[in-house]
Interface confidence: low
């Protein structure tokens, strides 16, 4: 339905608080380097304008599109050229090209300092002094570091952030109350950002057909009692929501997400028995709860799939009449029966089924040709099952840190051209799959592990796209979304790689090492490990383990010394020489 003023429509639908929060997030995700105060000023100006349009929808400029209004506002920033360089050229374009231009300049790895958490008393005083500014600052800092963060979900995180401070700043032991909550929000926030980044990559790089296939599979697992038509409706609506958010249309996205939550809660009976407790909650919490809801129980009497998709003589006729609908139904039927499979595996099976039908429906005897199609699925199913089994065994044997190290070595050998910080970040996150998924019962391990790995590998893909250095990475990232993980798993030692020259500076350490947190120490050691593998890609596990054990002993020794810096200066070169000899 059309409105005379889009900005007035969204302001009335969302309310002032959510409107302002979403505009702040949108601006912070586009102009990631602008100071907080500049963004607040822009948001206030947009909000005042929106209020005039609410009062009189026919007032001047109220009929303009949101992209036009927001783009015009962003282009008033005085320092655009100095701060953003060629992004300023976007302002010479007309809509919709201007918005596309802004989207293309979103930076997945902005050069921003890591957020330092002040002391609890400092934060509590700031919270009490000016709660509104405090919460806006949170939205701004998260949004500029995560330019694809799912905006309505970020409002939910901000609400939880506010609740944490409201509760804990009154507590007797503020730190004991607050710090675990902030850690949880930080970790959940990073995971949420990475999951949304995969959705946006899926839409932007592979199109809405790819996203819809993912959504059919996932929603069919969650809502196995729902009819195909119901799942299709939810998929269509969900695709619209995520297309909008990934495209920077955050007001429309939040509004449509609220409508989708409303629809789901009004139609629980035909969707899932698990929605009830979500639907009693306030809007932000309700939408989050619906997105995270557990899988409903599978109907008890589901017939075998073979009857309709293998044994029927009408398979090719049904396929030819409406290919995407037929494949969608196949995916829905397979997924609702297999909550124990990863979404990516289900999509590979649908792809294999489609390829078989394409080949067989053109053959002399189609039925004979596709009769064994389900047998062809077996190796596709066994590959991730075996991968999860082997890696969980390795994780249980080594523990998280050493498991991460094993993955660091594995991935550095596969793609040594990738920058060391990226290899460390990605391998550390790949290694977290162990703690996250290996403790789960067998039926939940594969969906947890493989779908998590897809999210982490997408991070590698978006970072690599910014500065491409490896044809192998480009190939695995761009050829097929569903086969990314198997593609990376299949990579071997890169024989063409010319080992990196040894640089003693890379292996020179100082007394500051001793004051680092445990996590920071691990990152330092893992950075050194990647550099070692880049220098000696054919080093054996035993050689690398020996060097890393010596490294740990050397650091421990010097951190216990009275004159730490002198110890590092003296023992460091000895460690480097011994390492070179061990790897020669």
């Amino acid at each position: 339905d059309t409105h005379k003023s889009e900005v007035a429509h969204r302001f009335k639908d969302l309310g002032e608080e959510h409107f302002k929060g979403l505009v702040l997030v949108a601006f912070s995700q586009y102009l990631q380097q602008c100071p907080f105060e500049e963004h607040v000023k822009l948001v206030n100006e947009v909000t005042e304008f929106a209020k005039t349009c609410v009062a009189d929808e026919s007032a001047e400029n109220c009929d303009k599109s949101l992209h036009t209004l927001f783009g015009d506002k962003l282009c008033t920033v005085a320092t655009l050229r100095e701060t953003y360089g060629e992004m300023a050229d976007c302002c010479a374009k007309q809509e919709p090209e201007r918005n596309e231009c802004f989207l293309q300049h979103k930076d997945d790895n902005p050069n921003l300092p890591p957020l330092v958490r002040p002391e609890v008393d400092v934060m509590c005083t700031a919270f009490h002094d000016n709660e509104a500014t405090f919460l806006k600052k949170y939205l701004y800092e998260v949004a500029r570091r995560h330019p694809y963060f799912y905006a309505p979900e970020l409002l939910f995180f901000a609400a939880r952030y506010k609740a944490a401070f409201a509760e804990c700043c009154q507590a007797a032991d503020k730190a004991a109350c607050l710090l675990p909550k902030l850690d949880e929000l930080r970790d959940e926030g990073k995971a949420s950002s990475a999951k949304q980044r995969l959705k946006c990559a899926s839409l932007q790089k592979f199109g809405d057909r790819a996203f819809k296939a993912w959504a059919v599979a996932r929603l069919s697992q969650k809502f196995p009692k729902a009819e195909f038509a119901e799942v299709s409706k939810l998929v269509t609506d969900l695709t619209k929501v995520h297309t909008e958010c990934c495209h920077g249309d955050l007001l429309e996205c939040a509004d449509d997400r609220a409508d989708l939550a409303k629809y789901m809660c009004e139609n629980q009976d035909s969707i899932s028995s698990k929605l009830k407790e979500c639907c009693d909650k306030p809007l932000l919490e309700k939408s989050h709860c619906l997105a995270e809801v557990e899988n409903d129980e599978m109907p008890a009497d589901l017939p075998s799939l073979a009857a309709d998709y293998v044994e029927s003589k009408d398979v090719c006729k049904n396929y030819a009449e409406a290919k995407d609908v037929f494949l969608g139904m196949f995916l829905y039927e397979y997924a609702r029966r297999h909550p124990d499979y990863s979404v990516m595996l289900l999509l590979r099976l649908a792809k294999a089924y489609e390829a078989t039908l394409e080949k067989c429906c053109a053959a002399a005897d189609p039925h004979e040709c596709y009769a064994k199609v389900f047998d062809e699925f077996q190796p596709l199913v066994e590959e991730p099952q075996n991968l999860v089994k082997q890696n969980c065994e390795l994780f249980e044997q080594l523990g998280e840190y050493k498991f991460q190290n094993a993955l660091l070595v594995r991935y550095t050998k596969k793609v040594p051209q990738v920058s060391t910080p990226t290899l460390v970040e990605v391998s550390r996150n790949l290694g977290k799959v162990g703690a996250k998924c290996c403790k789960l019962p067998e039926a939940k391990r594969m969906p947890c592990a493989e779908d998590y790995l897809s999210v982490v590998l997408n991070r590698l893909c978006v970072l690599h796209e910014k500065t491409p250095v490896s044809e192998k990475v480009t190939k695995c990232c761009t050829e097929s979304l569903v086969n990314r993980r198997p593609c990376f798993s299949a990579l071997e030692l890169d024989e063409a790689y010319v080992p990196k020259a040894f640089n003693a500076e890379t292996f020179t350490f100082h007394a500051d090492m001793c004051t680092l947190s445990e996590k920071e120490k691990q990152v330092k050691k893992q950075t050194a490990l990647v550099e070692l593998v880049k220098h000696k890609p054919k080093a054996t596990k035993e050689q690398l383990k020996g060097v890393m054990d010596n490294f740990a002993a050397f650091v421990e020794k010097c951190c216990k010394a009275d004159d730490k810096e002198a110890c590092f200066a003296e023992e460091g070169p000895k460690f480097v020489a011994a390492s070179q000899a061990a790897l020669a």
């Epitope: 907080f36 002040p118 400092v122 002094d129 000016n130 500014t133 405090f134 600052k137």
Partner: nanobody, 115 residues
Framework: QVQLVESGGGLVQPGGSLRLSCAAS????????MAWYRQAPGQQREFVAR???????NYPDSVKGRFTISRDNAKNTVYLQMNSLRAEDTAVYYC?????????WGQGTLVTVSS
Amino acid sequence: QVQLVESGGGLVQPGGSLRLSCAASGSIESINRMAWYRQAPGQQREFVARISKGGSTNYPDSVKGRFTISRDNAKNTVYLQMNSLRAEDTAVYYCAAGPVWEQFWGQGTLVTVSS
């Protein structure tokens, strides 16, 4: 970045007064809040006083009525006037500043209250 330099610490008798100064330099246009904290040996760092750009102030009960924070925006300096000093006020006093919370810190100045 913002650099903060404290001065004015020293030895004072119980009941005496002292005035601390903190000069800010660097990217000070973003500074909305300036504050004083203190840390006694073996103790947690403790909030002492805060002043916003507009001049609003707040203090914990332990110093209320004895300490006064003020700010000279033209000189980018914040002051802490400490009266009726007690032995338990002995500590290193730190100046802190920031846009929304105090994220920049000085090196500290020692205040010793002793007879």
